[in-house]
């Protein structure tokens, strides 16, 4: 019986049951490799989870997350909660990030700004909930009477009208 | 990245028995099928047992039918071959392996497997 089983591609299970020896996977199960006794229930995605690809008879369902939710692990085996820019996922729901910490996603956590100074730098526009601070040149880079918050005016070209 | 850790090998008696455990990380572990080879030595890997992604059917060498018990903890990622009645003719080098998504050869074929746990011995 081994020998005739191991004959029996994927999509099929062997069935000792019937003469004829290889059987289609019944609706609703599948078999990814051959040689299979039984054809594995495929994997359904309800609740949270929405289809992504529908199972056939040699591979199983993918799922995604519904609109509000990320998927989580290297096949969508969780969805977990989006948050707001701004925030992050705690045992208690979503929170705003604490004031020196940003998150620019809908997922992940608040991560500390920048620290221009650690790279000699000074910051250019400050940091938010939602955004990193941004760096500009370390105050010795500037040239006297230069100022550090408006960037010279580009050039125009000859024959340009302005926008 | 993919690992499988195994753990629980050891000595016994014949008509012991003994656990051994298969810890999955870097990946969902519960959309994969899941089996145990094993390999006595100057002999070729042996299928022991499959079970399926949702632990919802297994297959089973007749070598260890009745004897040997596949489960597995999903919520722990995890593993398990309950080994009972153990004889001489198991001692060997057992091994958890991760199905792939797709394979054209036999279910108890090595091949069909893509991740490995690094082994565990049995005597």
């Known amino acids: 019986l081994q020998d005739l089983c191991s004959n029996c591609p994927a999509g099929t299970f062997c069935d000792n049951n019937r003469s004829q020896i290889c059987s289609p996977c019944p609706p609703n199960s599948f078999s990814s490799a051959g040689g299979q006794r039984t054809c594995d229930i495929c994997r359904q995605c309800k609740g949270v989870f929405k289809t992504r690809k529908e199972c056939s008879s040699t591979s199983n369902a993918e799922c995604d997350c519904i609109s509000g939710y990320h998927c989580l692990g290297a096949e969508c085996s969780m969805c977990e909660q989006d948050c707001k820019q701004g925030q992050e996922l705690t045992k208690k729901g979503c929170k705003d990030c604490c004031f020196g910490t940003f998150n620019d996603q809908k997922r992940g956590i608040c991560r500390p700004w920048t620290n221009c100074s650690l790279d000699g730098k000074s910051v250019l526009v400050n940091g938010t909930k939602e955004r990193d601070v941004v760096c500009g040149p370390s105050p010795a880079d500037l040239s006297p009477g230069a100022s550090s918050a408006t960037p010279p005016a580009p050039a125009r070209e000859p024959g340009h009208s302005p926008q | 990245q993919v690992q499988l850790v195994q753990s629980g090998g050891g000595l016994v008696q014949p008509g012991g028995s003994l656990r051994l455990s298969c810890a999955a990380s870097?990946?969902?572990?519960?959309?994969?099928?899941m089996a145990w080879f094993r390999q006595a030595p100057g002999k070729e890997r042996e299928f022991i047992g499959r079970l399926a992604w949702n632990g919802g059917s297994t297959d089973y060498a007749d070598s260890v039918k009745g004897r040997f018990t596949i489960s597995r903890d999903n919520p722990k990622n995890t593993l398990y071959l309950q080994m009972n009645s153990l004889k001489p003719e198991d001692t060997a080098v057992y091994y958890c392996?991760?199905?792939?998504?797709?394979?054209?050869?036999?279910?108890?074929?090595?091949?069909?497997?893509?991740?490995w746990g690094q082994g565990t011995q049995v005597t």
């Open positions: 392996a991760r199905q792939r998504s797709y394979s054209r050869y036999g279910i108890r074929a090595p091949q069909t497997y893509d991740y």
């Open positions: 870097g990946w969902a572990f519960d959309n994969y099928g």
